[in-house]
Interface confidence: medium
């Protein structure tokens, strides 16, 4: 379970049409459900129930985005349509270059993602929790354009990376 170093850039437009970028760094973990790879793409927030839809034609994105999924408490969804692993697979099938799960409300998902699939996904599946998850979801919930870059090695100057 290697550390995933995630950088997120948020694009804030100004009335003049220019934009300002805000970069923030956070850490997560690569799960055994996916590959320990670098990835980058525009963030697409996905609702866990949205991944239940079987009609892939209806909900197909172009390839290359990073899916962000906030998992709910298990009690709120006692009979999920898909396992967490199934949700990761569905996101990758729909074109995600990586999937990031916020497991703060559902820590059991960590074990599910790390059970060691015989057929792991060829794209990274990362989970975040706590302060890192709050940071990520604050950006995602702004409903503005944001990009994520996932790295599998730590920066050699952490202060430079995290001092945003």
């Amino acid at each position: 379970k290697e550390t995933a170093f995630v950088e997120v850039v948020l694009f804030e437009s100004s009335p003049s049409g220019d934009y300002t970028t805000y970069t923030t760094g956070l850490t997560g973990r690569f799960s055994r459900a996916g590959a320990t790879l670098s990835a980058e793409g525009e963030i697409v927030q996905m609702h866990p129930l949205g991944l239940c839809n079987n009609n892939d034609e209806e909900d197909l994105y172009e390839y290359g985005w990073v899916g962000v999924v906030k998992l709910e408490q298990p009690e709120l969804d006692p009979k999920p349509c898909l396992t967490v692993l199934g949700k990761a697979k569905r996101a990758v099938q729909r074109g995600a270059t990586a999937v990031i799960f916020d497991v703060s409300e559902n820590p059991e998902a960590i074990d599910q993602l790390n059970q060691g699939s015989e057929d792991p996904l060829k794209r990274p599946v990362v989970y975040v929790k706590g302060a890192d998850a709050i940071k990520l979801m604050n950006i995602v919930n702004k409903q503005k354009v944001a990009r994520a870059r996932i790295q599998h090695r730590p920066p050699r100057q952490p202060t430079e990376y995290f001092d945003m």
């Epitope: 170093f5 525009e42 270059t97 790295q151 050699r156």
Partner: antibody
């Protein structure tokens, strides 16, 4: 103003390797992407891969995977691109490309290019 | 990989002409597109980023438009120094890919 200064032209035999260097002068690039883009004579531009020195991890285009290695030495603000198993089609100008700050996806800072000729 | 296709591959124009170059992506890339100018023996130069934002120091006769899969670079009044090759580049996802180039020649 950061400038990217590349090593000189190289002539190589097929099957050998070449290592091109790119030094940032007038600044450091520790948290800026350094990418390598090549251009064969009379042809278009082709992205080979890139690295962020503070991470040390590189991303490569599938076409070059296994044949190219991109590294960076923060202490000297120098990035390197090594291409192995050279063939005549690798004859090209190799550009070191970066951005003025942060991780980038558009290339606003270019080295002058290094001509690599592969000939027996 | 995302394929970028430019048209035309070359064109002849006169000083003062309005010139339009198009670039088509094989899938939607939102607005993650740049345009570069390259003169013989020189490194490319960034002109436009995010499909329509003008890079600092680039003359305002250059403009970009489009989103999704279809993009356009326009030079409103061609100047002698604008005769060059122009490339588009997608920045939506790895690997970054370029169009094959459009050469603008003197008529």
């Amino acid at each position: 103003q950061v400038q990217l200064v590349q090593s000189g032209a190289e002539v190589k035999k097929p099957g050998s390797s070449v290592k091109v260097s790119c030094k940032a002068s007038g600044g450091t690039f520790s948290n800026t992407d350094i990418n390598w883009v090549r251009q064969a004579p009379g042809q278009g531009l082709e992205w080979m891969g890139g690295i962020i020195p503070i991470f040390g991890t590189a991303n490569y285009a599938q076409k070059f995977q296994g044949r190219v290695t991109i590294t960076a030495d923060e202490s000297t603000s120098t990035a390197y691109m090594e291409l192995s198993s050279l063939r005549s089609e690798d004859t090209a100008v190799y550009y070191c490309v970066g951005g003025r700050s942060g991780w980038i996806w558009y290339f606003d800072l270019w080295g002058r290019g290094t001509l690599v000729t592969v000939s027996s | 990989d995302i394929q970028m296709t430019q048209s035309p591959s070359s064109l002849s124009a006169s000083v003062g002409d309005r010139v339009t170059i198009t670039c088509r992506a094989s899938q939607s890339i939102s607005r993650w597109l740049a345009w570069y100018q390259q003169k013989p023996g020189k490194a490319p130069k960034l002109l436009i980023y995010d499909a329509s934002s003008l890079e600092t120091g680039v003359p305002s006769r250059f403009s970009g438009s489009g989103s999704g899969t279809d993009f356009t670079l326009t030079i409103s009044s061609l100047q002698p120094e604008d005769f060059a090759t122009y490339y588009c580049q997608q920045a939506y996802s790895f690997p970054w890919t370029f169009g094959q180039g459009t050469k603008v020649e003197i008529k």
